[in-house]
Amino acid sequence: SVLHLVPINATSKDDSDVTEVMWQPALRRGRGLQAQGYGVRIQDAGVYLLYSQVLFQDVTFTMGQVVSREGQGRQETLFRCIRSMPSHPDRAYNSCYSAGVFHLHQGDILSVIIPRARAKLNLSPHGTFLGFVKL
Amino acid sequence: SVLHLVPINATSKDDSDVTEVMWQPALRRGRGLQAQGYGVRIQDAGVYLLYSQVLFQDVTFTMGQVVSREGQGRQETLFRCIRSMPSHPDRAYNSCYSAGVFHLHQGDILSVIIPRARAKLNLSPHGTFLGFVKL
Amino acid sequence: SVLHLVPINATSKDDSDVTEVMWQPALRRGRGLQAQGYGVRIQDAGVYLLYSQVLFQDVTFTMGQVVSREGQGRQETLFRCIRSMPSHPDRAYNSCYSAGVFHLHQGDILSVIIPRARAKLNLSPHGTFLGFVKL
């Protein structure tokens, strides 16, 4: 299974200090992964290469994303990317890419969280994306 | 074979101007790779995807890591990641990720070197890690 | 098929506001990919993991690279990496890595473009490289 996702939109709930991205498939091979709003549901357990990039346009001193999984009654951070940002708006433009190999369980929900309220993201599909490759 | 490693600790020898990371397996499939203190020993020769991320909290003007291999009487750089760092300690927070595909030989020792004495690293397992996927 | 490429040189045509990199193979397995000057020709259609890193030594406010494909009469951006750069030349040193999974067609030409005239790149093979893994 292979899945490459690109953004539909990004939102912060009113009382939340995080921003989440809603995803849609750009490339899909196999049935083992299912885009589901702000998350991706794992249908086939196994070892996956996961990758995530977010394009930030924000003067907040550091920006980044956390890729986490929720399943079997608990939430776990898999990996994160952190980028210090310039304070000048014209210069505050950075992509943050990270990736890793993890064992995912059937029913896990994977999500990308930016731990900032109303984070200023560029949702271009070549700047912000999320992907899975079953190994 | 698949191996995803996370840090145990990082040290600079007294007379050394580099910082090295000691690794432990977080995910392991197959017997082809063996964590060995500050290095990873290749048991099965072949073509591997290698990836490395280090999370820096350091105001030194540029930080980064070098992934190198030692084997058959030679040491060589495989790839490197470089990140310019802000001079203000509160802002100096950057992850540096890189990866590539390389032919590794039996007996090679792979290591991650930060070419700075006493580099200030964040050894969180979701911020600093090292991985191998046999292709 | 696997292909890891390193730079031969980088040039900007006189009237152009982009810099392109000419590539040579460092590791090659299979016949499905062919380095061809500033591009890589796809011989075998399929789903590929592509990765790209460029090492910048440039004080231009933001630097980065675009990985695009040309084929079937059109050009398409696959992914890009963006890095804000310090204004001081001694600090302006950043690698920019990105990667993703894409379906490539026979005859496609893949290239790495830096959308800056005469971009100051470090063409060390460990800092600037391009790779493909057929999944």
């Epitope: - | 190198s68 040491q75 070419p115 | 800092g127």
Partner: antibody, heavy 121, light 112 residues
């Protein structure tokens, strides 16, 4: 472009030590090993050893252990080789050479101009 | 140590002639990975050595195509198809497969 600039000629007394330098430019110093090679007068070439500046690791030809000590200073992109307890047998030209390690080969692709060491009382 | 023996010691040639230099190793210079790190270097009078050939037969960038390397195991050859004046000097073979790495004794290419 890649350059290796070696220090000037040395005239030293028997039993003394000498430290030769090799300043690198035009590439990332820590990414490539520096080899040292000896050429005695009218003779061929002998490999002394290498240092990898990225980690400080070294590999010596057993013949030169105790005679040669290789070091590297990353801040100045300079490799050094100290020769100790000098005798007339150590009179030679010493070369530093960068070893490349990509595009499928290893080889000493760039060389310094050499430093002449003469041991004489 | 691997002993590298070059023949001849001296090779007088006329400009435009072909020249051939042999290098024989005391044991195989194939390393445990299956790679043969056999190189050829040219040292012109008063200069540093220059890399000509790596991994038996691959020309280094900028080296004219009149230079070619061949061989395997313990027997290697460097050929110059048409000798030019700038080719004069001492040619060394070198093995980087087994530590300590070793050079041949050299072959001096000179004008007849």
């Amino acid at each position: 472009q890649v350059q290796l600039q070696q220090s000037g000629p040395e005239l030293v007394k028997p039993g003394a030590s000498v430290k030769l330098s090799c300043k690198a430019a035009g590439y990332i110093f820590t990414d490539y090993t520096i080899n040292w090679v000896k050429q005695s007068p009218g003779q061929g070439l002998e490999w002394i050893g290498w240092i990898y500046p990225g980690s400080g690791n070294r590999k010596y030809n057993d013949k030169f252990k105790g005679k040669a000590t290789m070091t590297a200073d990353k801040s100045s992109s300079t490799a050094y080789m100290q020769l100790s307890s000098l005798t007339s047998e150590d009179s030679a030209v010493y070369f530093c050479a960068r070893e490349s390690n990509y595009v499928g080969y290893y080889a000493m692709d760039y060389w310094g101009q050499g430093t002449s060491v003469t041991v004489s009382s | 140590d691997v002993l590298m023996t070059q023949t001849p010691l001296s090779l007088p040639v006329s400009l435009g002639d072909q020249a051939s230099i042999s290098c024989r190793s005391s044991q195989s210079v194939v390393n445990s990975n299956g790679n043969t790190y056999l190189e050829w270097y040219l040292q012109k009078p008063g200069q540093s050595p220059n890399l000509l050939i790596y991994k038996v037969s691959n020309r280094f960038s900028g080296v004219p195509d009149r230079f070619s390397g061949s061989g395997s195991g313990t027997d290697f050859t460097l050929k110059i198809s048409r000798v030019e004046a700038e080719d004069l000097g001492v040619y060394y073979c070198f093995q980087g497969s087994h530590v300590p790495w070793t050079f041949g004794g050299g072959t001096k290419l000179e004008i007849k």
